[in-house]
Interface confidence: medium
């Protein structure tokens, strides 16, 4: 576990878990329901999600200088998606297939966020936008868009942890 004061996380563990997250996010994507091409729209669901951006210190130089900025951003995103996957968007009708990896994905998001959470210190988490749909027909598209956005997020996180494991591990 990472500790306050800028200590490093268990980079190798984080790398392994983030790679698992990537695999799960891609395998969950087609299983959330058959996407209908009639369903479209702007990326509303991703407007408010945590993005890993240039100023977040997730580049190699930023990670070397102080990895905590980047890790906090990743942690925020993990908590954000963990909450979304536990919401009625995913738990409500239409039910997910019994073998859907969404449950595993949810647990892995929580697991990685716990690896990053410093002992005795709580990073500020981002508010979830009000996306709770009242009707089942709305959920299929939201699931699709959330998972598509999650795929992009965990891909970046996995690259960060791969770099950290290769160059920053003690």
């Amino acid at each position: 576990r990472a500790v306050p004061g800028g200590s490093s996380p268990a980079w190798t563990q984080c790398q392994q878990l983030s790679q698992k997250l990537c695999t799960l996010a891609w395998s969950a994507h087609p299983l959330v329901g058959h996407m209908d091409l009639r369903e479209e729209g702007d990326e509303e669901t991703t407007n408010d999600v945590p993005h890993i951006q240039c100023g977040d210190g997730c580049d190699p130089q930023g990670l070397r200088d102080n990895s905590q900025f980047c890790l906090q951003r990743i942690h925020q995103g993990l908590i954000f998606y963990e909450k979304l996957l536990g919401s009625d968007i995913f738990t409500g009708e239409p039910s997910l297939l019994p073998d859907s990896p969404v449950g595993q994905l949810h647990a892995s998001l929580l697991g990685l966020s716990q690896l990053l959470q410093p002992e005795g210190h709580h990073w500020e988490t981002q508010q979830i936008p009000s996306l709770s749909p009242s009707q089942p027909w709305q959920r299929l598209l939201l699931r699709f868009k959330i998972l598509r956005s999650l795929q992009a997020f965990v891909a970046v996180a996995a690259r960060v942890f791969a770099h950290g494991a290769a160059t920053l591990s003690p």
Epitope: D36, E93, P133, S134, Q135, L140, L142
Partner: antibody, heavy 117, light 107 residues
Framework: EVQLLESGGGLVQPGGSLRLSCAAS????????MHWVRQAPGKGLEWVSS????????WYADSVKGRFTISRDNSKNTLYLQMNSLRAEDTAVYYC??????????WGQGTLVTVSS | DIQMTQSPSSLSASVGDRVTITCRAS??????LNWYQQKPGKAPKLLIH???NLQSGVPSRFSGSGSGTDFTLTVSSLQPEDFAIYYC?????????FGQGTKVEVK
Amino acid sequence: EVQLLESGGGLVQPGGSLRLSCAASGFTFSNYAMHWVRQAPGKGLEWVSSIWPSGGITWYADSVKGRFTISRDNSKNTLYLQMNSLRAEDTAVYYCARVGAADFDYWGQGTLVTVSS
Amino acid sequence: DIQMTQSPSSLSASVGDRVTITCRASQNINSFLNWYQQKPGKAPKLLIHVASNLQSGVPSRFSGSGSGTDFTLTVSSLQPEDFAIYYCQQTYSIPLTFGQGTKVEVK
């Protein structure tokens, strides 16, 4: 009292365009998803399109996909349906409806669109 | 797409009669079914939502039942104002589809 009032219908030639409006009152419009539904003369009901409360997500029936565009202006409490490349089979009464706790809980009175040469 | 099939297409009844209309979905829609009443020249009016929940302001003589693929709308004692066309509709998945309608006429 919830009220939905459609306007903008009329006679248009095949291939022409029309924009329908649905003025909403009596509720916080920006909190609700909305639908357009149509009914050809003497026929049943057909769902046309739906839109997310902020307008960022839209859904369409196959029969109108690529020709119709649903949109909304939450500052004006108004829902729109832009209809292009109109065909005779688009002739119908067009209704807007609200997605409340019960879907399609309130409907407007409808506006008639006639596509004919 | 989920097809909704109503039966009968029309029926003749008298005031005071008990009337039952059925609706069948082509696949499981759980309980996500609405019933509407439409009178000539008027917009449809929501009667029942989620298969069995009476919409506010709708008389208690209307009731709905069913889940999965088979659903029923019952009018326990038909009143003069109940002669109309009734539609079922699934709100489970896009495209949202309606039954073809059942016309309730005066016998």
